[in-house]
């Protein structure tokens, strides 16, 4: 404990952000809300039937740099968007599936929309 009159620089506390979560709620989440020191995200993925699956949740600060930029995955489509500007900001994120590349028509299932 510091003595009276001794000054000390405040240790910056990590900002706690609340996010909506769906399919990615940790065990301790309440009312589909999770907390993080990092980012809120909303993600869209294409399932085996070609249908879009939208999910959301919290991303820890560690490693969120590569989570929040789209990383290629083979023969399937996925897109993620992240935000930090306010609590539950991911309610307003609407990522879209990236366009099919030519090779996906060869390698993956063909879905007529």
């Amino acid at each position: 404990k510091k003595e009276d009159g001794e000054s000390t620089a405040p240790t910056p506390r990590p900002k706690v952000l609340r996010c909506k979560c769906h399919h990615h709620c940790p065990e301790d989440s309440v009312n589909n809300i999770c907390s993080t020191d990092g980012y809120c995200f909303t993600m869209i993925e294409e399932d085996d039937s070609g249908l879009p699956v939208v999910t959301s949740g919290c991303l820890g600060l560690e490693g969120s740099d590569f989570q929040c930029r789209d990383t290629p995955i083979p023969h399937q489509r996925r897109s993620i968007e992240c935000c930090t500007e306010r609590n539950e900001c991911n309610k307003d994120l609407h990522p879209t599936l990236p366009p099919l590349k030519n090779r996906d028509f060869v390698d993956g299932p063909i879905h007529h929309r």
Epitope: I73, R78, R103
Partner: antibody, heavy 124, light 107 residues
């Protein structure tokens, strides 16, 4: 930070089964695929399969389909691999590895965080 | 299954050297090529994903390149802590497969 804890070693008799564990911490367990990899002494790495903790969905390497069964316990953030009908060929180090990317249904191929491995010895 | 071949099983180099480790796939893997480092104590680290993207915390002296079936990992200015076995892995097609490894030793 992401941590995957595996027991150091297991000794089992031929013909028996064993259930290897991998306790995860430092991230939302249900959000990432967990992979299992085998390494025989002095050899390369072999991918056994993967499980998504949220859905329980699995993908197996055909070579291990009759040997390995992957499960999870979400409440304890633990992944398990049961190996059956053990022979000396199953003596190896077994690693669990968490994927890089958050995923719900898509399959992702990046083994970003590894456990220390469990040395399995099958001997009478 | 896609076969991954690391033709050089062991490699000797001096500290400060530039080292290149190569990996070949039996078919086009569309840049879904990852690199791992295994230390003598068995610890495995993820280094590079999708051919050339550095995982967080990996020193910038590591780099990856390649396309189609041919890929390589380069370590510039080799350091003592880089002494390990390096494995490539294809993530294009299930089952995922690894190369046999290249053991890097100090001259």
């Amino acid at each position: 930070q992401v941590q995957l804890q595996q027991p150091g070693a297991e000794l089992v008799k031929p013909g028996a089964s064993v259930k290897l564990s991998c306790k995860a911490s430092g991230y939302t367990f249900i959000s990432y695929w967990m992979h299992w990899v085998k390494q025989r002494p002095g050899q390369g790495l072999e991918w056994i399969g993967m499980i998504h903790p949220n859905s329980g969905s699995t993908n197996y390497n055909e070579s291990f389909k009759s040997k390995a069964t992957l499960t999870v316990d979400k409440s304890s953030s633990t992944a398990y691999m049961q190996l059956s009908s053990l022979t000396s060929e199953d003596s190896a180090v077994y690693y669990c590895a968490r994927d890089l990317l958050i995923a719900t249904v898509v399959v992702t191929p990046y083994f970003a965080y590894w456990g220390q491995g469990t040395i399995l010895t099958v001997s009478s | 299954d896609i076969q991954m071949t690391q033709t050089t099983s062991s490699l000797s180099a001096s500290l400060g050297d530039r080292v290149t480790i190569s990996c070949r796939a039996s078919q086009d893997i569309s840049n879904f090529l990852n690199w791992y480092q295994q230390k003598p104590d068995g610890t495995i680290k993820f280094l590079i994903y999708y051919t050339s993207r550095l995982h967080s915390g990996v020193p910038s002296r590591f780099s990856g390149s390649g396309s189609g079936t041919d890929y390589s990992l380069t370590i510039r200015n080799l350091e003592q802590e880089d002494i390990a076995t390096y494995f490539c892995q294809q993530g294009n097609t299930l089952p995922y497969t690894f190369g046999g490894g290249t053991k890097l030793e100090i001259k």
